[in-house]
Amino acid sequence: PASLAGCYSAPRRAPLWTCLLLCAALRTLLASPSNEVNLLDSRTVMGDLGWIAFPKNGWEEIGEVDENYAPIHTYQVCKVMEQNQNNWLLTSWISNEGASRIFIELKFTLRDCNSLPGGLGTCKETFNMYYFESDDQNGRNIKENQYIKIDTIAADESFTELDLGDRVMKLNTEVRDVGPLSKKGFYLAFQDVGACIALVSVRVYYKKCPSVVRHLAVFPDTITGADSSQLLEVSGSCVNHSVTDEPPKMHCSAEGEWLVPIGKCMCKAGYEEKNGTCQVCRPGFFKASPHIQSCGKCPPHSYTHEEASTSCVCEKDYFRRESDPPTMACTRPPSAPRNAISNVNETSVFLEWIPPADTGGRKDVSYYIACKKCNSHAGVCEECGGHVRYLPRQSGLKNTSVMMVDLLAHTNYTFEIEAVNGVSDLSPGARQYVSVNVTTNQAAPSPVTNVKKGKIAKNSISLSWQEPDRPNGIILEYEIKYFEKDQETSYTIIKSKETTITAEGLKPASVYVFQIRARTAAGYGVFSRRFEFETTPVFAASSDQSQIP
């Protein structure tokens, strides 16, 4: 039979072309891409491949070693001068490791038939590749009809005698895929029908999407689908100390590429992303939520001595409201308002002040007015009560002024203007206020309400009364107006500094109407209601009677 080197013997050693070829070809990188998993690589098998040639004088293994003295498994056949060639080379059983689609990469050389003298009629430039699925590792079968053809393999580049002389080897690489596979493994078979071939390497592999960490989610090694257009949806799992709102998913393509990421993981509160992992926030730093990118320094007036803090602790005398975000500085109550001044107008007081020097670090400062009525003699103060009106309001004041109306006249008041903010109610400390003491102006007194008759005679009536409920100042005198009933136009007025009088020169057995009013520096109050008293008859004894209702 013709050899590939051009001689027509069947040498036991590899001819020159094989050496040249292997020296060139096998220096090519043996490493496979990370998304390819080899099921078989004839270049890396150290011992016997365990392949079978049938018939025995067809394909033959050429035993060579590379520069590291590792065996090189090369099969060649070159029966180009003989008709009806049917030489089979069967691999050992190859596990598919769960892959449903596998790839076969062949590296081979092929002699150009035109360069072979006298063999044009019988010489071929192709060979066939077949496979046979089997769960049985020992079920190698050489019945041709049980093998399924994968493809006819032709060379892109064939070599000539000239190439041999120039030591130029034209190595072909062909890749075919097979699928879907349904059994645990398979056998490959190479059929020569009269070509001059050297099969340098056979690599069988499947493609996977290699395990990857993306967006803090771990996606496992995933074998690609059987269909060349299929995208497999794969769920990822969040790395340590990370969480997700939307479960992470990616799609594994038939080519072993990860595509179309959906969702992501985020480092949980107290952890931040660094180099694809979630690292703990160190003391002095915090992260309140997974949605925040990185740990931040504690805000002013707060600290944390813990790792993995989700918030910081407020310093002594500083506070944080529940509604304050953890990124906000801790704050404290404000200092007292300053420079309070008052303006009294009769029974109204206008107060004005300037804001506290220290707002406690907050913008929500407001003011509260406490009103106390003080007894100038006893020095005792009491709450003013509900009759006082505050304009615009007593608490929650945003402006630095307020008006109090409906105060009592000629009364000592203490007003406490307190500054408060959002954390005042959290602080056990003393209230921060400025005090203003004022005395309201005197006003006309209120009416006299309580009048008692005293000694009544035929020509006189004695009366006594109590000071008005609200004198509104110092009572200077009382004015008593009286007239005979139904003769209102003819009245008499008596003035008295005391709370008793006697009206003289009255008619016996007559009804008289009395009205009393008090006067302060601010003027007279209104007259009291009418009180009617009757003088005694001429012959009656005088009487001393109690209070008239």
């Epitope: 160190r282 003391p283 002095g284 320094k297 504690c298 600290y303 001595h305 790792e307 993995a308 602790v313």
Partner: antibody, heavy 120, light 111 residues
Framework: EVQLVESGGGLVQPGGSLKLSCAAS????????IHWVRQAPGKGLEWVAY????????YYADSVKGRFTISRDNSKNTLYLQMNSLRAEDTAVYYC?????????????WGQGTLVTVSS | DIVMTQSPDSLAVSLGERATINCKSS??????????MNWYQQKPGKAPKLLIY???NLESGIPDRFSGSGSGTDFTLTISRLEPEDAASYYC?????????FGQGTKLEIK
Amino acid sequence: EVQLVESGGGLVQPGGSLKLSCAASGFTFSTFGIHWVRQAPGKGLEWVAYISGASTTIYYADSVKGRFTISRDNSKNTLYLQMNSLRAEDTAVYYCARYGTSFPYGLDYWGQGTLVTVSS
Amino acid sequence: DIVMTQSPDSLAVSLGERATINCKSSQSVDYDGDSYMNWYQQKPGKAPKLLIYGASNLESGIPDRFSGSGSGTDFTLTISRLEPEDAASYYCQQSNEDPFTFGQGTKLEIK
């Protein structure tokens, strides 16, 4: 007023054990990290161990790792240092010190120290 | 571990003069823009006292004649006008990385 008071020091034989205490007052103990620092006679300061307020963060010096255990009881405002397998080189005054609140934190309050002597 | 080396081991300075103590760390003690370097003063028989934290921040209650500077691996404690009560040992300490190591100390004497 912030105060830290160490106790439990004394003479112990090599290989023996001792438990130091540090009583704290004048601050919210449970929110503060506390350190143990020691000083051998005539030598410099050596940091020993740290525990955070919630005991979630604990660090040790290599020289005491595996032999000393730092712990705390926040309900008693007390810090502890359990010292086992004591060696002569552990002889020192042991101080507890509070981690400060001004960032980046220093050790702002220290106890008066308690002397541990390891000798046969 | 980060090794802290102080220089000099001791120095004598006259009253009213400036005293400078250096501290070098075997690796940077900076993190996120801050230097985790503290300085302490210790008098014989007493507990140490914090003077400077974060390389340059004066602890409350410490006289302003004390100051700190530096970043990365090189730091300095300066006492601008020496007072009699400043005679003591001074220690630098890094708190950037566990273990929180101290320098060997510098003894300052008044001339």
